[in-house]
Interface confidence: low
């Protein structure tokens, strides 16, 4: 009779993480008598996966009934596969011996490859806000995928970004891999509503990439522009001065009125109006009693936005002229820019 052969018909088996792997093995003869064992790896360091004779292997089930006398099918199923299960599995026939069974013949081995989906990409931005025209960095991370081949792309509002660096770790063989990418994004004044997207494509996703997003509203700070104007006289000896605070983000803003350097009133932006680009406008006004002043009055609108150093704009109120003669075109001493936006 021909000598027993151990046949593992599958050179390789590909299984998705979480699924069950079937490792096939048949013997060509019932003799010699003795058990079958399954190992992962070869040599002295091999790992026992299943022993027909003894032991507890909760994740392993046999395909056929190994207790039947004429059974020659020693295939097994391994449940709930993880990337850590990847490797080459050997079906090994032992010959009954005393005191120990003796290894008789091994199958050629079946390589188990595990495909695992990448985790949802997590995008994180800088810890502190930055103003337009600054370059900020975003990171994207995804973990636990296998095989190693993966593609990552960055987009800002649907437009692909090119300034990024990506690493897949580890460099060598591993049961699973991680990807880390850092992209540089230049902020513009219109970025309050913008999104940065990290897209990851992998064999397990089949053209339906995973996306992670970050809203630039959490990253950007748009500083306000100030404009102080004197309104027409409301009543005898009273002048209304307004401070227009325009195009700022986020909303956190405190405004202080100074009359000749002395604090007159402080308020916090509350009823703001929102622009199409997501920035805010706000207006504060100060009623000045001209008769209480003998000399010209220097009015200053001072704004502290989002915890940043205060910016201010001043306006000289001429007391010498009769209030009724004062129009809104009174010469103003301005510090900083004076954008005039029409709303």
């Amino acid at each position: 009779e021909e000598e027993l052969q151990v046949i593992q018909p599958d050179k390789s088996v590909l299984v998705a993480a979480g699924e069950t792997a079937t490792l096939r093995c048949t013997a060509t003869s019932l003799i010699p008598v003795g058990p079958i064992q399954w190992f992962r790896g070869a040599g002295p360091g091999r790992e026992l996966i299943y022993n027909q004779k003894e032991g507890h292997f909760p994740r392993v089930t046999t395909v056929s009934d190994l207790t039947k006398r004429n059974n020659m099918d020693f295939s097994i199923r391994i449940g709930n596969i993880t990337p850590a299960d990847a490797g080459t599995y050997y079906c090994v026939k032992f010959r009954k011996g005393s005191p120990d069974d003796v290894e008789f013949k091994s199958g050629a081995g079946t390589e188990l490859s595990v495909r695992a989906k990448p985790s949802a990409p997590v995008v994180s931005g800088p810890a502190a806000r930055a103003t337009p025209q600054h370059t900020v960095s975003f990171t994207c991370e995804s973990h636990g995928f296998s095989p190693r081949d993966i593609t990552l792309k960055w987009f800002k509002n649907g437009n692909e970004l090119s300034d990024f660096q990506t690493n897949v770790d580890p460099v060598g063989e591993s049961v699973s891999y991680s990807i880390h990418s850092t992209a540089k994004v230049v902020l513009t004044r219109e970025d309050v509503h913008s999104q940065v997207i990290c897209e990851v494509a992998h064999v397990t996703l089949q053209g339906d990439p995973l996306r992670g997003t970050a809203n630039l509203s959490e990253t950007i700070r748009v500083p306000p522009t100030l404009e102080v104007t004197q309104q027409p006289v409301r009543a005898e000896n009273q002048v209304n001065v307004t401070c227009q605070v325009r195009k700022f983000y986020p909303q956190r803003l405190q405004l202080t009125w100074l009359e000749n350097g002395n604090v007159s009133r402080t308020e916090t932006a509350s009823t703001v109006t929102e622009n199409k680009d997501g920035t805010y406008n706000w207006m504060s006004w100060l009623l000045v009693n001209v008769s209480a002043h003998r000399d010209d009055v220097k009015l200053t609108c001072q704004v502290e936005h989002d915890g940043q150093p205060a910016v201010s704009k001043s306006h000289d109120l001429k007391v010498s002229a009769h209030p009724k003669e004062q129009g809104s075109n009174t010469a103003a001493e301005n510090t900083g820019s004076n954008e005039r936006n029409i709303y």
């Epitope: 998705a16 081949d149 593609t151 649907g158 494509a201 089949q206 053209g207 339906d208 990439p209």
Partner: antibody, heavy 123, light 107 residues
């Protein structure tokens, strides 16, 4: 070389069902999604949906939910389209088409097409 | 659903002519646009993906351009084997949708 080979023409009566096969050759079926496209006589192309050949999960376009079933038999590298309760308006050529690739973001462009299967529904 | 409108629906041209077919999307599809060629009784053949990239084996006389909503397929010098129906397809958003086709006939 890469080929998608579809089953032959079918003549069916209304109310019957039909199963069209699409055998993938020259590549591993489970590496690329498989789409199904319908072309009624003298008409244009209409996307029916696709099946993720790795997970077996189907996605159906709006007009193809219910009577249409996408399935796989990976052991024979074959994708299937089954149509139940056939109607005269199901008469068309049905194509399988492979999604271009998974290492880029052009998941919905088709690089290879089957030769088509004509399904005729007539009493 | 995104509507894809091709123009013209049909056109007659001669061998050696330069021909342009346009495709307009009802919404922005970025560059997620493909072109296919179909001859009577045959399966479609893939020509262009990502609006501008030719598949391997597609002659260089075929070129694609455009992004967003407006796209064109240009055949620089018509050959006898180019007379067929051409379809554009967007794959930016499910459901994937095709144009109604442009039939290119011999003049």
């Amino acid at each position: 070389q890469i080929q998608l080979v579809q089953s032959g023409s079918e003549l069916k009566k209304p109310g019957a069902s039909v199963k069209v096969s699409c055998r993938a050759g020259g590549y591993t079926l489970t590496d690329y999604a498989m789409n199904w496209v319908r072309q009624a006589p003298g008409q244009g192309l209409e996307w029916m949906g696709f099946i993720n050949t790795y997970t077996g999960e189907p996605t159906y376009a709006q007009g193809f939910k219910g009577r249409f079933v996408f399935s796989l038999d990976t052991s024979v590298s074959t994708a299937y389209l089954q149509i139940g309760s056939l109607k005269a308006e199901d008469t068309a050529v049905y194509y399988c088409a492979r999604t271009r690739g998974y290492y880029d973001f052009d998941g919905g462009a088709f690089d290879y097409w089957g030769q088509g299967t004509l399904v005729t529904v007539s009493s | 659903d995104i509507q894809m409108t091709q123009s013209p629906s049909s056109l007659s041209a001669s061998v050696g002519d330069r021909v342009t077919i346009t495709c307009r999307a009802s919404q922005n599809v970025g560059t997620h646009l493909a072109w296919y060629q179909q001859k009577p009784g045959k399966a479609p053949k893939s020509l262009i993906y990502s609006a501008i990239y030719r598949y391997i084996g597609v002659p260089s006389r075929f070129s694609g351009s455009g992004s967003g909503t407006d796209f064109t397929l240009t055949i620089s010098s018509l050959q006898p084997e180019d007379f067929a129906t051409y379809y554009c397809q967007q794959y930016n958003t499910y459901p994937l949708t095709f144009g109604q086709g442009t039939k290119l006939e011999i003049k």
